[in-house]
């Protein structure tokens, strides 16, 4: 159960003070500090766990990835988990801590010295999410190590959105991921389905920009479920 996962980490993964990053083991549930308004807007760390639900890695912090807290867990229960350090097992790049990537199921350093321009990319993923399965097929894609020094511009190959410049996100394009523009008002968006895997999204769109959400276009309400058009609209 979720509680047993939380409790099993109760001693070794106490949250750090003031929201600082901590060296969690990869399986730890994120213990996130919050802001307590009654006490004068001060940060307060809380010693019990605060699971943070997510559907994709982008909803989590830079030192986290999104996954089920238990092996083979319910697809509808995914939370932000602490990233995996070097030499830890992985299934996709986002599982590895910044400065590392997933190669042959292990987190390895992406430093220039170690990086050889080859990344293993697992492509069998949930619809709109970045949750690979162990039986995924692997493709190889070439990536310039230069991207680790400057923020990627539109079309640059990336591993995660933090590799991309402001206003861009890292999204799948064929078998690799590239920096694409965050969607603007009126642009067509992908409404992520509630539960379960719905195949591979080969051309992944970015999320809607700030103050926008992905909703059914007004004049498409009568259309059938499969043909409904979603666009980025003001809240």
């Amino acid at each position: 159960t979720l509680n047993s996962v939380l409790n099993s980490n109760a001693i070794k993964n106490l949250p750090p003070p003031l929201g600082g990053a901590a060296g969690h083991p990869g399986s730890a549930v994120s213990a996130a500090p919050g802001i307590l308004y009654p006490g004068g807007n001060k940060y307060q760390t809380i010693d019990n766990y605060q699971p943070y639900p997510c559907a994709e890695d982008e909803e989590c912090g830079t030192d986290e990835y999104c996954a089920s807290p238990t092996r083979g867990g319910d697809a509808g229960v995914q939370i932000c988990l602490a990233c995996r350090k070097r030499r830890k097992r992985c299934m996709r790049h986002a599982m590895c801590c910044p400065g590392n990537y997933c190669k042959n199921g292990i987190c390895v350093s992406s430093d220039q010295n170690h990086f050889r321009g080859e990344i293993e990319e697992t492509i069998t993923e949930s619809f709109g999410n970045d949750h690979s399965t162990l039986d995924g097929y692997s493709r190889r894609t070439t990536l310039s190590s230069k991207m680790y020094h400057t923020k990627g511009q539109e079309g640059s190959v990336c591993l995660r959105s933090s590799d991309c410049a402001s206003g861009l996100c890292c999204a799948r394009h064929f078998w690799s991921k590239i920096c694409k523009p965050v969607l603007k008002e009126g642009q067509v968006c992908t409404k992520h389905r509630r539960k379960g895997s719905h195949g591979l999204e080969i051309f992944q769109r970015c999320y809607c920009g700030e103050g926008l959400s992905c909703r059914i276009q007004k004049d498409h309400h009568q259309a059938s479920n499969s043909s409904r058009l979603h666009t980025c609209q003001r809240h």
Partner: nanobody, 124 residues
């Protein structure tokens, strides 16, 4: 800054139901979760339930699973907690929490902002 206002708390008999609401304002980040936590007298604050921004992932504490349902209305920036089959041990101050996972804002870890809390008393 984020402001969270809870409502719907009150006195209810065991077996009864309540629906808590949480209105959030000042949320500027693109992707957020909303959650509920509670603190009983003399106890630590504990996690109750949370839902991610798209509704694709919901998480519940074992103690409320099957009895409580969390939902959210993105267009209104409002979260709800439907509490059924209430027990005396559910008596607590219930806090709404708005999360900022915010990878695109460079946060190393997802985190929550807290509301002031609303009291729920389950007693006959």
């Amino acid at each position: 800054e984020v402001q969270l206002v809870e409502s719907g708390g009150g006195l209810v008999q065991p077996g009864g139901s309540l629906r808590l609401s949480c209105a959030a304002s000042g949320i500027t980040f693109k992707r957020y979760a909303m959650g509920w936590f509670r603190q009983a007298p003399g106890k630590e604050r504990e996690f109750v339930a949370a839902i991610n921004w798209s509704g694709a992932s919901t998480v519940y504490a074992d103690s409320v699973k099957g009895r409580f349902t969390i939902s959210a209305d993105n267009s209104k920036n409002t979260a709800y907690l439907q509490m059924n089959s209430l027990k005396p041990e559910d008596t607590a101050v219930y806090y709404c929490a708005a999360g900022n996972g915010g990878r695109q804002y460079g946060h190393s870890r997802a985190r929550y902002d807290w509301g002031q809390g609303t009291l729920v008393t389950v007693s006959s």
